[in-house]
Interface confidence: medium
Amino acid sequence: IWELKKDVYVVELDWYPDAPGEMVVLTCDTPEEDGITWTLDQSSEVLGSGKTLTIQVKEFGDAGQYTCHKGGEVLSHSLLLLHKKEDGIWSTDILKDQKEPKNKTFLRCEAKNYSGRFTCWWLTTISTDLTFSVKSSRGSSDPQGVTCGAATLSAERVRGDNKEYEYSVECQEDSACPAAEESLPIEVMVDAVHKLKYENYTSSFFIRDIIKPDPPKNLQLKPLKNSRQVEVSWEYPDTWSTPHSYFSLTFCVQVQGKSKREKKDRVFTDKTSATVICRKNASISVRAQDRYYSSSWSEWASVPCS
Amino acid sequence: RAVPGGSSPAWTQCQQLSQKLCTLAWSAHPLVGHMDLREEGDEETTNDVPHIQCGDGCDPQGLRDNSQFCLQRIHQGLIFYEKLLGSDIFTGEPSLLPDSPVAQLHASLLGLSQLLQPEGHHWETQQIPSLSPSQPWQRLLLRFKILRSLQAFVAVAARVFAHGAATLSP
């Protein structure tokens, strides 16, 4: 058993049929010695008396808010949550496996630049009685500070018969060094509590590996005289690290016909313009990627040819 | 070339070669052996690999003030990785093809380090770890990790040379 926060405790249980459970001793936070009784949740049934209460925690029915009283007055509370371990593996019932980039990916994180700011998100089908707490650091043995905000519900989607809820959190490294080569990974830890179930999820990454630039901005076409060719130009996204002579991007320009089956013409360039042939009813799209490190491409910025 | 007294390197040549190094480091990575390695979390234990750190002056302001600190750090790293790529870790079984990206990467690391340091001028180089002949599992693991680490190192080096070519070239 360990303390998650004041008056909230997590009991770690091996979860299998007829498991012995854990013996837990609760102590009433009071100078009083006599006439103390214990109850669980809203029940008025007295579970025991005395300054301490010893219970055998085996299942969710044994978890909840234990309260010690004296003469009708509440003295203190202890909320017991359960953390299940089945076949040696901690349960992951609360969050959905996003399966990208690999199985057992519950947390996904992205950064728009090298400033040390990043966003993580996760999915769940649970709509109520759900709380999240996020902590982060650079490295784990001698951790350096990363400050995370509160997790917020960022999207709701309908998937078949189910509703899916996306939560996200923004974090910022306290002393970021955008130009340095990272040697210690960022660690992100999410505590999830659903009713009386506790779970924790972690992710470890380098900012360089989660970079995904915003799409190029101000995408424009300039027809070239007496030609089917057009000059496409664009600019670096505002959110990308500066100076651009140091934090450079590379770009992919694509000409795509109306039909998905039509052949795509692609050009790769380090410049912020390119000359392409504009077909009727086609569209021109441009996306960006770090020039020197193969992290994710941005989403496409697009304009129609006409 | 970076010479004693701190004159400038051939920024544009360094930029071109460092960008080529980035491409090679990424094309070499999947080809380091029959990789069925589980993608492990990135450990905190790359203790013997030189990193370009915050105080090394490789940021735009540091380059403007005095690029020599940063260039020396990059040179150390290039020599370190060049030695590793020429070691038993990459030459032993399972063997790589002679024209593999690793061989080109090895040659390019050497080329860039020579551009940075002409004859007769010697910066201190970091001690290269000496590893006894290793088994294939050890080589495969090390190749994978070394190339991952090299990708990060050459990305920073390439940014330095791109910025230098754009802003510090005579």
Partner: antibody, heavy 117, light 108 residues
Framework: QVQLVQSGAEVKKPGSSVKVSCKAS????????ISWVRQAPGQGLEWMGG????????NYAQKFQGRVTITADESTSTAYMELSSLRSEDTAVYYC??????????WGQGTLVTVSS | DIVLTQSPATLSLSPGERATLSCRAS???????LAWYQQKPGQAPRLLIY???SRATGVPARFSGSGSGTDFTLTISSLEPEDFAVYYC?????????FGQGTKVEIK
């Protein structure tokens, strides 16, 4: 002459963890890898994983992935193997061995780990 | 992972006889990175052969290894009383090392 000396026998409860140490003497610890092999009573040898202390890089058998952590402390020339979420089937003798190009040429004396409620 | 199958499971022989132990791999063992170990009750294994055919330091000449690809053999030319033990083959050509299930050489 390299020698590997392991920590003593352990009795553990199901669900708990065990950490076995393996101290090397008489050679350059960093210059080779250390593998961990276990042997259940009356059974054969089973490779669990290995570490290259110089780099701190570990490689694990698929079967133990996520449950075993192999580490090394160069300053004390000691390798460690921690196995979590123990079950009765983990009762075995755990060996560390120096793992070089010629196979596992030097072995520790073995550590018996008994998992019992 | 490469699966190693040893045969026979038990070999009953008398001192002075020749012992031939087989180890078959489910896929080719790259570079013949195959080792043989001897283990006596209550003791740690001892390396006998590495690289399929090279004898480890201090191993008597009566032990020899041969084979390549997927089929490997350990031969004990003339069994001594101290040779009665369990023998394991192990491949180390792959990112995951594996052992065979062992062959017990017992006194007939």
């Amino acid at each position: 002459q390299v020698q590997l000396v392991q920590s003593g026998a352990e009795v553990k409860k199901p669900g708990s963890s065990v950490k076995v140490s393996c101290k090397a003497s008489g050679g350059t610890f960093s210059n080779y890898a250390i593998s961990w092999v276990r042997q259940a009573p009356g059974q054969g040898l089973e490779w669990m994983g290995g570490i290259i202390p110089m780099f701190g890089y570990a490689n694990y058998a698929q079967k133990f992935q996520g449950r075993v952590t192999i580490t090394a402390d160069e300053s004390t020339s000691t390798a460690y193997m921690e196995l979590s979420s123990l079950r009765s089937e983990d009762t075995a003798v755990y060996y560390c061995a120096r793992d070089i190009y010629a196979g596992m040429d030097v072995w520790g004396q073995g550590t018996l780990v008994t998992v019992s409620s | 992972d490469i699966v190693l199958t040893q045969s026979p499971a038990t070999l009953s022989l008398s001192p002075g006889e020749r012992a031939t132990l087989s180890c078959r791999a489910s896929q080719s063992v790259l570079g013949n990175y195959l080792a043989w170990y001897q283990q006596k009750p209550g003791q740690a294994p001892r390396l006998l052969i590495y690289g399929a055919s090279s004898r480890a330091t201090g191993v008597p000449a009566r032990f020899s290894g041969s084979g390549s690809g997927t089929d490997f053999t350990l031969t004990i030319s003339s069994l001594e009383p101290e040779d009665f033990a369990v023998y394991y083959c192990q491949q180390y050509s792959h990112i995951s090392l594996t052992f065979g299930q062992g062959t017990k050489v017992e006194i007939k």
